[in-house]
């Protein structure tokens, strides 16, 4: 993350990733002051003229916005005064991926951080067993992905094993035309054993288990973002 | 090595017009908002106009407002400034320089400009 | 408009300690910049963000600004940093100083 301490007061940012079409949080902290009024908050985008967001004298202040951030922006008025300059971004777009500066003045001077932010879809894939299939079948689906991610598939029996051959990805494109549902179907699936499929690019990883018994299916999803650092 | 070279600077009349160009190398071109900055004969440095990275947001110093005009061909990393209704003050050494946040980190060698019958 | 004052000329032996200043109305709140500008040449950024220095800029270039007044000191100066010198802020354009003329005796 990125800390300046040189123009006398710390800003702290986190790198994060942006889920297109949802809110994103742009995440940035500071020495609080004792007076919100004495408070200036402003978010600037390299490459863009206008300004990101503004908030000075306990309120937001617009007048320099960028058209490409008009109505999209927000920040978290009642924590300001604790320190939280973060950045709230609803629908985000693709194009709001970039480098982003946390800009801070208060009474006991000013300071400003960076933070890269990178932007694309990722979901939580769901495995089901495909009763319709010719043989034992496992189908991994996940609605939302960008950039085209990579599918591999894990099993806990057979650690380390190749399932390329034996199985078979498809990518189709949403209907906003950017972002892709991911299908990826594993054949000649034994019972008793737990498979993953685990899908990535360069922002998020996510992986769906399953496990298949006699008696019953267990599932489960997990999704984290690269390249942030909580 | 991150380069900008200007081009397309002359002799012209009152009245005329004239397109600079400049031309970037060694960085990701798109990603940088640019500026044109000129400086008349014995001044100092004036600012001119300014373009967003994505070329969809332009400012312009009210001496110039109307009369020209910044652009960018993202495809060919080249910068422009069209010049019309040229006047004898706007002859100047004209600069593009890479805008870096509040400032600019990267200029050009320039071009000269000269407007004269 | 937003406007910036600087000194026509400051004069400084060599290995002393040059100050440039640059006065606007509560400049201390905005990001101030500093260009060095030899004869002939396009100006080159020395000080950006106040006070940072950009890498192969000697460490003998500093900044500092708060309240209305933003300065620019150059410590045991050499002949080779005689120069023209620009501040500037961002205001919906980049504004310029009137430049300083930086004469090494």
């Known amino acids: 993350f990125g800390i300046s301490g040189r123009h006398s007061i710390t800003v702290t940012t986190v790198a994060s990733a942006g889920n297109i079409g949802e809110d994103g949080i742009l995440s940035c902290t500071f020495e609080p002051d004792i007076k919100l009024s004495d408070i200036v908050i402003q978010w600037l985008k390299e490459g863009v003229l206008g300004l990101v967001h503004e908030f000075k004298e306990g309120k937001d202040e617009l007048s320099e916005q960028d058209e490409m951030f008009r109505g999209r922006t927000a920040v978290f008025a009642d924590q300001v005064i604790v320190g939280n300059a973060s950045l709230r971004l609803k629908n985000v777009q693709l194009t709001d991926a970039g480098t982003y500066k946390c800009y801070i003045i208060t009474s006991k001077g000013k300071g400003n951080a960076n933070l890269e932010y990178k932007t694309g879809a990722f979901s939580m894939p769901e495995v089901n067993v495909d009763y319709n299939a010719s043989s034992e079948t496992l189908r991994c689906e996940a609605p939302r992905w960008f950039p085209q991610p990579t599918v591999v598939w894990a099993s806990q029996v057979d650690q380390g094993a190749n399932f390329s051959e034996v199985s078979n990805t498809s990518f189709e494109l949403n209907s906003e035309n950017v972002t892709m549902k991911v299908v990826s179907v594993l054949y000649n699936v034994t019972i008793n054993n737990t498979y993953s499929c685990m899908i990535e690019n360069d922002i998020a990883k996510a992986t769906g288990d399953i496990k298949v018994t006699e008696s019953e299916i267990k599932r489960r999803s997990h999704l984290q973002l690269l390249n942030s650092k909580a | 090595e991150v380069q900008l070279v200007e081009s397309g600077g002359g002799v012209v009349q009152p009245g005329r017009s004239l397109r600079l160009s400049c031309a970037a190398s060694?960085?990701?071109?798109?990603?940088?908002?640019m500026n044109w900055v000129r400086q008349a004969p014995g001044k100092g440095l004036e600012w001119v106009s300014a373009?967003?990275?994505?070329?969809?947001?332009?400012y312009y110093a009210d001496s110039v407002k109307g009369r020209f005009t910044i652009s960018r061909d993202n495809s060919k990393n080249t910068l422009y400034l069209q010049m019309n209704s040229l006047r004898a003050e706007d002859t100047a050494v004209y600069y593009c320089?890479?805008?870096?946040?509040?400032?600019?980190?990267?200029w050009g060698q320039g071009t000269t400009v000269t407007v004269s019958s | 408009s937003y406007e910036l004052t600087q000194p026509p000329s400051v004069s400084v032996a060599p290995g002393k300690t040059a100050r440039i200043t640059c006065g606007g109305n509560?400049?201390?709140?905005?990001?101030v910049h500093w260009y060095q500008q030899k004869p002939g040449q396009a100006p080159v950024l020395v000080v950006y963000?106040?006070?940072d220095r950009p890498s192969g800029i000697p460490e003998r270039f500093s900044g500092s600004n708060s309240g209305n007044t933003a300065t620019l000191t150059i410590s045991r100066v050499e002949a080779g940093d005689e120069a023209d010198y620009y501040c500037?802020?961002?205001?919906?354009?980049?504004?310029f100083g009137t430049g300083t003329k930086l004469t090494v005796l």
């Open positions: 963000d106040d006070s």
């Open positions: 509560n400049i201390g709140s905005k990001s």
């Open positions: 500037q802020v961002w205001d919906r354009g980049m504004i």
């Open positions: 320089a890479r805008k870096r946040w509040y400032g600019m980190d990267v």
């Open positions: 060694g960085f990701t071109f798109s990603d940088r908002a």
């Open positions: 373009i967003s990275a994505s070329g969809a947001s332009r």
